[in-house]
């Protein structure tokens, strides 16, 4: 061989929503006269080199990864070695290596970034009745089943950030999705609006919740 096969993958991570299908793109440049009988293609987890999917001995050897992967057989001869990953899970996140061997061999790694949008936050107050200016209340903002971990921001009705007396906890469920609970302790003014913003840093998706307290009674804005 005069030079090793060049394997190309996207530089940027592939972002996939939980439950959807993702395509991990990989390509190589077949030489004139190339046939699939010459191709040995391995998709593997980069970190461990564990087999994910393979095409060897002229045929698709199938998925070694929970039967959720597939190649694009009609496109292989043109040098398209992309892998389809079905029903993406949080646990799929990471680096996948596309290893191509013809007369020589080469590899390239592509990153899969998994994401899930956060639900619209629900807001609760404690105590939630007979509130008067000067009372200390805890406002809890809860948003569910997102990934990766959220960034949470609080602000008042004038848009001024509220950073003190905020406690945020995030817990992963069995699927790896996060439920976020952020608690703001605040001394009530005569009236006021308190907003929480839950941001998914990968999707750049913001979910907003707010509560308005006007002496008595207090009101929650209608759900959007």
């Amino acid at each position: 061989p005069t030079g090793a096969v060049e394997v190309q993958v996207p530089e940027d991570p592939v972002v996939a929503l939980v439950g959807t299908d993702a395509t991990l793109r990989c390509s190589f440049s077949p030489e004139p006269g190339f046939s699939l009988a010459q191709l040995n293609l391995i998709w593997q987890l980069t970190d461990t080199k564990q087999l994910v999917h393979s095409f060897t001995e002229g045929r698709d050897q199938g998925s070694a990864y929970a039967n959720r992967t597939a190649l694009f057989p009609d496109l292989l001869a043109q040098g398209n070695a992309s892998l389809r990953l079905q029903r993406v899970r949080v646990a799929d996140e990471g680096s996948f290596t596309c290893f191509v061997s013809i007369r020589d061999f080469g590899s390239a790694a592509v990153s899969l970034q998994v994401a899930a949008p956060y639900s619209k936050p629900s807001m609760t107050l404690e105590p939630n009745k007979d509130l008067r200016p000067g009372d200390t209340v805890t406002i809890t903002c809860s948003s569910y089943r997102g990934y990766p971990e959220a960034e949470v921001f609080w602000q008042d009705g004038q848009g001024v950030p509220l950073t003190g007396n905020v406690t945020t906890s995030q817990m992963a469920n069995e699927q790896g999705l996060f439920d976020v609970h952020s608690v703001l302790r605040v001394v009530l003014g005569a009236n006021g609006t308190y907003s929480c913003l839950v941001r998914n840093p990968v999707l750049q998706q913001d979910a907003h919740g707010s509560v308005t307290i006007t002496g008595q009674p207090m009101t929650f804005p209608p759900e959007a």
Epitope: P1, A4, V5, E6, V7, N40, I42, Q44, T46, D47, T48, K49, Q50, L51, S54, T56, S95, T97, F99, S101, I102, R103, D104, F105, G106, S107, A108, A109
Partner: antibody
Framework: QVQLVQSGAEVKKPGSSVKVSCKAS????????INWVRQAPGQGLEWMGG????????NYAQKFQGRVTITADESTSTAYMELSSLRSDDTAVYYC?????????????????WGQGTTVTVSS | DIQMTQEPSLTTSPGGTVTLTCRSS?????????ANWVQEKPGQAPRGLIG???KRAPGTPARFSGSLIGGKAALTITGVQPEDEAIYFC?????????FGGGTKLEIK
Amino acid sequence: QVQLVQSGAEVKKPGSSVKVSCKASGGTFSNYAINWVRQAPGQGLEWMGGIIPMWQSVNYAQKFQGRVTITADESTSTAYMELSSLRSDDTAVYYCARDQVVATSGVNFGMDVWGQGTTVTVSS
Amino acid sequence: DIQMTQEPSLTTSPGGTVTLTCRSSTGAVTTSNYANWVQEKPGQAPRGLIGGTNKRAPGTPARFSGSLIGGKAALTITGVQPEDEAIYFCALWYSNLWVFGGGTKLEIK
């Protein structure tokens, strides 16, 4: 425990060729690449090229392109490295080292097993 | 050409902890470079210690660990033993070739 056993020392004339063998004892080449690495006296390690015996595909370092030929016989679990047009600066110890292509155990140990080395002396 | 930089020499004491690093001229080292660490002692063949960034080869003592630190591959020896005196080479995979670093000579004083 797999061992890589290499052929014995060689003394060669400038311009000639040398062929070094590397046999997997107590195991096979399955799922492995065999790399060839050399070390000149007082120098570091230098990768020359590698072969995946199960697919007979070979890569060479650009520096050795056209002068080195790496082959493998899967039936005997033996890899070979032939270096031609020898010069005095090819005097070195030549090693083979295996490296996993696919980690069947789910753990990638890298270049975990090395041959004992073959000393090649090029002298007129 | 890809250049890889290792500390030419390091000195440590028995029982101490030492970290050897391997920097690549191409940028940050990642898991796809499959960083390997190889130990060489005088008169002996090289011995693979670490593969795939952080996987100890069978027979490698637990005091050896591999990692990525600040964009470099790193080998940490915790509780250095006198027999750890050797030259340590890193090797990185670049798509279709291996490149070795120049080696770090580790002295135990």
